[in-house]
């Protein structure tokens, strides 16, 4: 994360800034939600542990046509060091549990806020 470019400035961005921007975007999504987020699309639940960003991307990348989460997908793509494509799954998914995108975003937001408070930026 320390070398992530292209967040708000041309150079590398501190991990705390990157994490804070992702949190702000997820807050924005939850606050501005009117109709069912992404038409009620369902995604695989994930283990909120190590490798969380790639796992979150692997889940959310299977949602297309949802403008509300496009920026989140871009951010997670920046956080995840390897190439992720739709239909790709890792062991980080809870493969027997699907939840609505809205719930997924809320769960991810709560976890990221916890990490931020604890200073776990990497």
């Amino acid at each position: 994360l320390t070398c992530l470019g292209g967040f708000a400035s041309p150079g590398p961005v501190p991990p705390s800034t990157a994490l804070r921007e992702l949190i702000e975007e997820l807050v924005n999504i939850t606050q501005n939600q009117k109709a069912p987020l992404c038409n009620g699309s369902m995604v695989w639940s994930i283990n909120l542990t190590a490798g969380m960003y790639c796992a979150a991307l692997e889940s959310l990348i299977n949602v297309s046509g949802c403008s509300a989460i496009e920026k989140t997908q871009r951010m997670l793509s920046g956080f995840c060091p390897h190439k992720v494509s739709a239909g790709q799954f890792s062991s980080l998914h809870v493969r027997d549990t699907k939840i609505e995108v809205a719930q997924f975003v809320k769960d991810l937001l709560l976890h990221l806020k916890k990490l931020f408070r604890e200073g776990q930026f990497n």
């Epitope: 292209g6 699309s41 046509g65 871009r74 793509s77």
Partner: antibody, heavy 118, light 111 residues
Framework: QVQLKESGPGLVAPSQSLSITCTVS????????VNWVRQPPGKGLEWLGM???????DYNSALKSRLSITKDNSKSQVFLKMNSLQTDDTGRYFC????????????WGQGTSVTVSS | NIVLTQSPASLAVSLGQRATISCRAS??????????LHWYQQKPGQPPKLLIY???NLESGVPARFSGSGSRTDFTLIIDPVEADDAATYYC?????????FGGGTKLEIK
Amino acid sequence: QVQLKESGPGLVAPSQSLSITCTVSGFSLTGYGVNWVRQPPGKGLEWLGMIWGDERIDYNSALKSRLSITKDNSKSQVFLKMNSLQTDDTGRYFCARDGYFPYAMDYWGQGTSVTVSS
Amino acid sequence: NIVLTQSPASLAVSLGQRATISCRASETVDSYGKSYLHWYQQKPGQPPKLLIYLASNLESGVPARFSGSGSRTDFTLIIDPVEADDAATYYCQQNNEGPRTFGGGTKLEIK
């Protein structure tokens, strides 16, 4: 399989409006965005606008005042309406599906030819 | 709006040689470490076909002769070696900022 098919009037008189329908199959409009792109004869591609699966609409800013994009999810149809047509609006009009992230246009219709002439 | 300028407007390349097409953006098309720049091929009488997404990722089914590179404002599409079937017009397109835009196109002729 994924298919998109445009249908339009072919000939439109100057100052009149153009209506084109894009009928899709093999995917749901609630889950994918659809773009409109046009190509004047012998020239390049121009992006007109798009409608996302969740209903957000983006337009080419230079044409925004003349364009309207809508859809009917139940009929699997996307509609383009353009007002005040002039001869330089003549060309081929394509609809194209947005794929998954990063939202490049992965499937295209064959296009429908539009001629603006009196 | 981001303006994409392609060069050259046309080029002729001998069979088996390398074709290089450039696309320059008026401002960065990078976001969160990725380049939102895609390449399409269009043959006469056909709709465009997606070749490369995110500057360097080959779309499924596209031959490995095609490759893309670049970041921020400067991008390149390379076809090596060129085959007869590659005669077409190639377009870059961005979806990073504001309205999506296409480059003006580069027509490739095979000698």
